[in-house]
């Protein structure tokens, strides 16, 4: 059998448009040989209507067209202005017509919903404005002007010049006289509902003078595009429903029973509890288009979605609207990492970022999702050394482990940084992934002073107290600086006495700085980690001041001074919204498989059974 | 959500007829292709037919092993597809299930026995006894 497959048979109506697509086998050959389309003969033989070498035959000429794509291992033929003359058998084939490359189509073209000679065919988009043209002879030029809808076997009035308007068409229909040149009158209806499709008479005059125009108005409802999205990973929806709705409140919702359409996120300020934390609706242009984003793909999140225009910011009848299938694929390349991870306050979290390994060399980045207004996503921290102003000193990012995932560390934890956050890259737009941080009761595990001060010239020794959980850890110091955490030698100070109920494998580890300069004031961290893998991390600031007395300094838990103000919001703050997020260059679109290797289990601490996969970054 | 109803399954002889329905309900904005697809035992679930919508204009597909005996056919008003199965063979017998809101009836997705359909009815059985 022929390995060409397509329609078996294709129904359309006189004046419509037809896209056939014909699927082959998608081998080096296959792809580069003609691709042709013919109709088949009373006598069995096949004339070529249109071929991709460039034949167009004379009935298909200013009508047709064949586009091959080789990648798909498809092409599509297009016909335009069908007639009932073009219902026949076809074939479309690859190579040689005579060949057996090739497929049979039924093409069969009906004279369409009963209209009568001269009607003139509207076909537009539900939600859009048409306009119906009206033609009349001088004789009628001050006569009444009137449109009917033939509704069963009567045509009731419409509109009319003498101002009457059918409640139907209330506040969406107006009727235009062209200047006395013009001998044509128009009718335009906004807000097309499905319901307006059918047949309509204009009239100019009242007698049997009177000249009629029929007219057939089919309202289309939107193709929905298909959208394919990986389990995990994110999707957007761009909406462009034209400058007309500019300053109209826009929406974007999921269809769930009936006609039913749940709003997932409008410029209103309403969003679906189910998208919080993972969607924003980027705001509009001049010319009323917008964009919708979702990260941490659900399959639950499959389904129907439409976007439009309305005052009341949901779908209306009459709402200009464009629609999308999503699909969600389960077997996704975006590999599992937790989406809840929990902190106590004044600990940590080390939060893992999936992003496609194959773009290890992207710019990884880190930002906060804020719910109000339509959501925005201001940037906190990326791979390139920024680091926003009151982040300073507890939010770093790593780009270990490499291979497909980075790594987020934020200390010094407080109520306030419970919320939302995006991984993303200026890679695969795709791979933008959603955590949620947690902030539940319970002491950090690492114990370390408050602020400590050295002395120029002398020497600082800081502990860090280390339960025994962590004995199986590699325990660290590093100063902080806005491009990582430097490591620094420490010593282990044998079992610690800071944890009641902790045996000998409790640990003090000490880091020790000699002969302190200007250069050593800044932030410390001491952490643990398993391989390149990070868990929790403590942060001192150390400030360092002129000799008052001679001596080395040990610093003790007891001596510990508060913690400094947090630092205020800098002004020149950045953010992933706006253009940012549809900026090519800063999310160019590529496709990739990645796999990540999985954490060694302390390193993520605990992994939740339940509804959301949750990393804890704090004893409990 | 979308539900889907399938009837008119049953026992026939080899040669005879037997017309399939599914009816849907649920969100009807664009519903771009249904389909028939039907799973015997230990085998992997195969194409039937599918029937595209794309505005005024219907593309049906068929799987080579029906061709010519099976017709499938939509009507919009009462929201049903239909699977009018002629001529059926032994080899018929199997599951029947209705699919809808595919993402484009034809090759690939036609080919990968409805992997990407997100709604499906419950089957009606079909055997054909020689």
């Known amino acids: 059998k022929s390995p060409i497959f397509g329609p078996e048979e294709v129904n359309s109506v006189e004046g419509n448009s037809v896209s056939i697509t014909c699927y082959y086998p998608p081998t080096s050959v296959n792809r580069h040989t003609r691709k042709y389309w013919c109709r088949q003969g009373a006598r069995g033989g096949c004339i070529t209507l249109i071929s991709s070498e460039g034949y167009v035959s004379s009935k298909y000429a200013g009508r047709a067209n064949l586009t091959n794509f080789p990648e798909n291992g498809t092409f599509v033929v297009n016909i335009a202005q069908l007639s009932q003359d073009d219902s026949g058998r076809y074939k479309c084939g690859l190579g040689i017509n005579s060949r057996g490359l090739s497929f049979d189509v039924s093409l069969e073209v009906s004279q369409g919903p009963g209209l009568l000679n001269d009607t003139k065919v509207y076909t537009v988009d539900l939600g859009r404005t048409v306009t119906i043209n009206c033609p009349f002879k001088t004789e009628n030029a001050q006569k009444r002007k009137s449109l009917y809808k033939q509704i069963g076997l009567y045509p009731v009035l419409v509109i009319d010049s003498s101002g009457y308007v059918n409640p139907n068409y209330t506040g969406r229909i107006r009727l235009d006289i062209q200047g006395t040149g013009q001998l044509l009158f128009s009718v335009v209806i906004n807000q097309l509902r499905l319901s307006d499709a059918g047949q309509y008479l204009c009239q100019a005059g009242d007698d049997s003078n009177s000249n009629k125009k029929n007219a057939d108005l089919q309202v289309l409802k939107p193709e929905p595009e298909l959208v394919y999205e990986d389990l995990r990973g994110s999707v957007t929806f761009h909406c462009a429903l034209g400058p007309e709705v500019a300053n109209v409140a826009k929406f974007l919702c999921r269809q769930s029973s009936g006609e039913n359409c749940d709003v997932v996120v409008n410029t209103l300020g309403k969003r679906a509890p189910a998208f919080e934390g993972r969607i924003l609706l980027n705001p509009q242009d001049k010319d009323g288009s917008f964009s919708v984003v979702i990260t941490g793909l659900r399959k639950e999140d499959a389904g129907r979605y439409l976007c439009g225009a309305h005052s009341d910011g949901q779908l209306q009848e009459g709402s200009p609207i464009q629609a999308w299938q999503l699909f969600v694929n389960e077997e996704s390349t975006i590999p599992r990492s937790p989406t809840v991870v929990k902190g106590v306050a004044g600990g940590s979290v080390a939060v893992l970022c999936p992003y496609n390994r194959k773009e290890s060399k992207s710019i990884k980045y880190w930002c906060l999702w804020e719910g109000a207004q339509n959501g925005r996503c201001p940037l906190l921290v990326d791979s390139e050394g920024w680091v926003k102003a009151q982040y300073e000193g507890r939010l770093s990012l790593l780009e270990e482990p490499g291979n497909g995932t980075f790594t987020v560390i934020l200390n010094q934890l407080t109520s306030r940084d419970a919320g939302f956050y995006w991984c993303l890259t200026n890679g695969d737009t795709l791979w933008r992934t959603t955590v949620e941080i947690k902030i539940i009761e319970g002491e950090p595990n690492l114990k370390v002073p408050g602020n400590v001060t050295a002395v120029l010239g002398e020497t600082l020794k800081v502990p860090c107290h280390f339960p025994c959980k962590f004995s199986s850890y590699e325990k660290y110091w590093c100063k902080w600086n806005n491009t990582g955490c430097q490591a620094l030698p420490s010593q282990d100070e044998g079992p610690s006495k800071a944890f009641v109920n902790c045996d000998e494998n409790s640990r003090l580890v000490s880091l020790t700085l000699n002969l302190v300069t200007r250069a050593d004031e800044g932030w410390y961290w001491c952490g643990v980690k398993q391989g390149h893998f990070y868990g929790e991390t403590a942060a001192v600031y150390v400030a360092v001041e002129e000799r008052k007395a001679a001596g080395s300094r040990d610093v003790s838990l007891a001596k510990a001074d508060a913690a400094p103000d947090e630092k205020v919001l800098d002004s020149g703050f950045r953010e992933i919204e706006n253009k940012a997020i549809q900026d090519p260059r800063l999310f160019a679109e590529e496709k990739a498989v990645a796999d990540t290797r999985d954490q060694a289990d302390g390193s993520r601490a605990s992994v939740d059974s339940g509804s959301s996969e949750e990393q804890g970054g704090s004893s409990r | 959500e979308v539900k889907l109803v399938e009837s008119g399954g049953g026992s026939v002889q080899a040669g005879g007829s037997l017309r399939l329905s599914c009816t849907a309900s649920g969100p009807t904005y664009g519903r771009t292709c249904m389909g028939w697809f039907r799973q015997a035992p230990g085998r992997e679930r195969e194409g039937v037919a599918t029937?595209?919508?794309?505005?005024?204009?219907?593309?049906?597909y068929y799987a080579d092993s029906v061709k010519g005996r099976f017709t499938i056919s939509q009507d919009d008003a009462k929201n049903t597809l239909y699977l009018q199965m002629n001529s059926l063979k032994p080899e018929d017998t199997a599951m029947y299930y209705c699919a809808a809101d595919g993402p484009g009836c034809s090759g690939g997705a036609f080919i990968a026995r409805g992997r990407w359909y997100p709604h499906w009815g419950q089957g009606t059985q079909v055997t054909v006894s020689s």
């Open positions: 029937i595209e919508t794309k505005g005024l204009t219907r593309y049906t």
